[in-house]
Interface confidence: low
């Protein structure tokens, strides 16, 4: 089951999945000057058994002035630029989730992709909040997000985390400013149970990861 | 990546309704983008009418239009409209359909720039007469 729309925003943060459901779809999208190569996939799908999961169909750019040149699908080691990153604010972060069975990993990147990827997520998916460069994390509980079915419907749970200027006095609870707060998405729906289709995801952190897992644009 | 086609303009009488609608084309999935309706009358600025999230969930509108404009999307259709309702002479002006690339890193519930679209219809003229 797709999620009826995307994670919630939080001012001056992005958020990123460790891992992705068995059912995510990642659009094969191609930066400005390529295009898909006709015969190729509109997306990549995350499937699987219970042992192991993997992306399923490549994604293929070719040139857009160029009718049957296909571009590899892999860069080359020399090829593969390093991408961009958010500097963290901290070196906390949440465990590896790229061996949790029905997951798959981040896909590697293509030749010629575009700079940003597109994701439709399912239930039960998970993200993790982190503030930007020049914010910091004012915690009132977990900073992620996770897509669940209540009354037959999807939603994201609210992440509890602020994100403050170093130099502004800090906010507390009640004094946030929502921004772009949707309408009638209420965070405590106690009247039906809410369930989710996967276990609950390991929320302990781990201080070893060398780069920061929330990637904002493929170079 | 994705083509926009308006439809559904025309002249109304004030207090009627119109029903405005975009088709989008292109080899790409609907659903990666979020639509906007934005108006431009003659001598004027391109401004925001409303957008709606590229799932529908979320939907946003101006203040001149609260309440009598409603935007929808049907991305069996690949389709996104604007019912008017109890139109007004100053509703006059072409209406512009715009979709934006939804980003996996970065999200936000509401754009109303006009910059913060990438892609364009050509318009279709509504005249509200008074």
């Known amino acids: 089951e797709l999620c009826d729309d995307d994670p919630p925003e939080i001012p001056h943060a992005t958020f990123k999945a460790m891992a992705y459901k068995e059912g995510t779809m990642l659009n094969c999208e191609c930066k400005r000057g390529f295009r898909r190569i006709k015969s190729g996939s509109l997306y990549m799908l995350c499937t699987g058994n219970s042992s192991h999961s993997s992306w399923d169909n490549q994604c293929q750019c070719t040139s857009s002035a160029t009718r049957n040149t296909t571009k590899q699908v892999t860069p080359q080691p020399e090829e593969q630029k390093e991408r961009k990153t958010t500097e963290m604010q901290s070196p906390m972060q949440p465990v590896d989730q790229a061996s949790l069975p029905g997951h798959c990993r981040e896909p590697p990147p293509w030749e010629n992709e575009a700079t940003e990827r597109i994701y439709h997520f399912v239930v039960g998916q998970m993200v993790y909040y982190q503030c930007v460069q020049g914010y910091r994390a004012l915690h009132r509980g977990p900073a992620e997000s996770v897509c669940k079915m209540t009354h037959g419907k999807t939603r994201w749970t609210q992440p509890q985390l602020i994100c403050t200027g170093e130099m502004e006095t800090s906010q507390f609870p009640g004094e946030e400013k929502p921004q772009a707060s949707p309408e009638g998405r209420p965070e405590s729906e106690t009247s039906c149970l809410v369930t989710t289709t996967d276990f609950q995801i390991q929320t302990e952190m781990a201080a070893t990861m060398e780069t920061s897992i929330f990637t904002t644009e493929y170079q | 990546q994705v083509q926009l086609v308006e439809s559904g303009g025309g002249l109304a009488q004030a207090g009627a309704s119109l029903r405005l609608s975009c088709a989008a084309s292109?080899?790409?999935?609907?659903?990666?983008?979020?639509m906007a309706w934005f108006r431009q009358a003659p001598g004027k600025e391109r401004d925001f009418v409303g957008s709606?999230?590229?799932?529908?969930?979320?939907?946003s509108y101006a203040d001149s239009v609260k309440g009598r404009f409603t935007i929808s999307r049907d991305n069996a259709k690949s389709t996104v409209y604007l019912q008017m309702n109890n139109t007004k002479p100053e509703d006059t002006a072409v209406y512009y359909c715009a979709a934006y690339t939804y980003s996996g890193s970065f999200y936000s519930t509401v754009k109303t720039h006009r910059d913060e679209y990438q892609y364009w219809g050509q318009g279709t003229q509504v005249t509200v007469s008074s």
């Open positions: 709606i999230s590229r799932y529908g969930t979320y939907t």
């Open positions: 292109g080899r790409t999935l609907y659903s990666s983008y979020g």
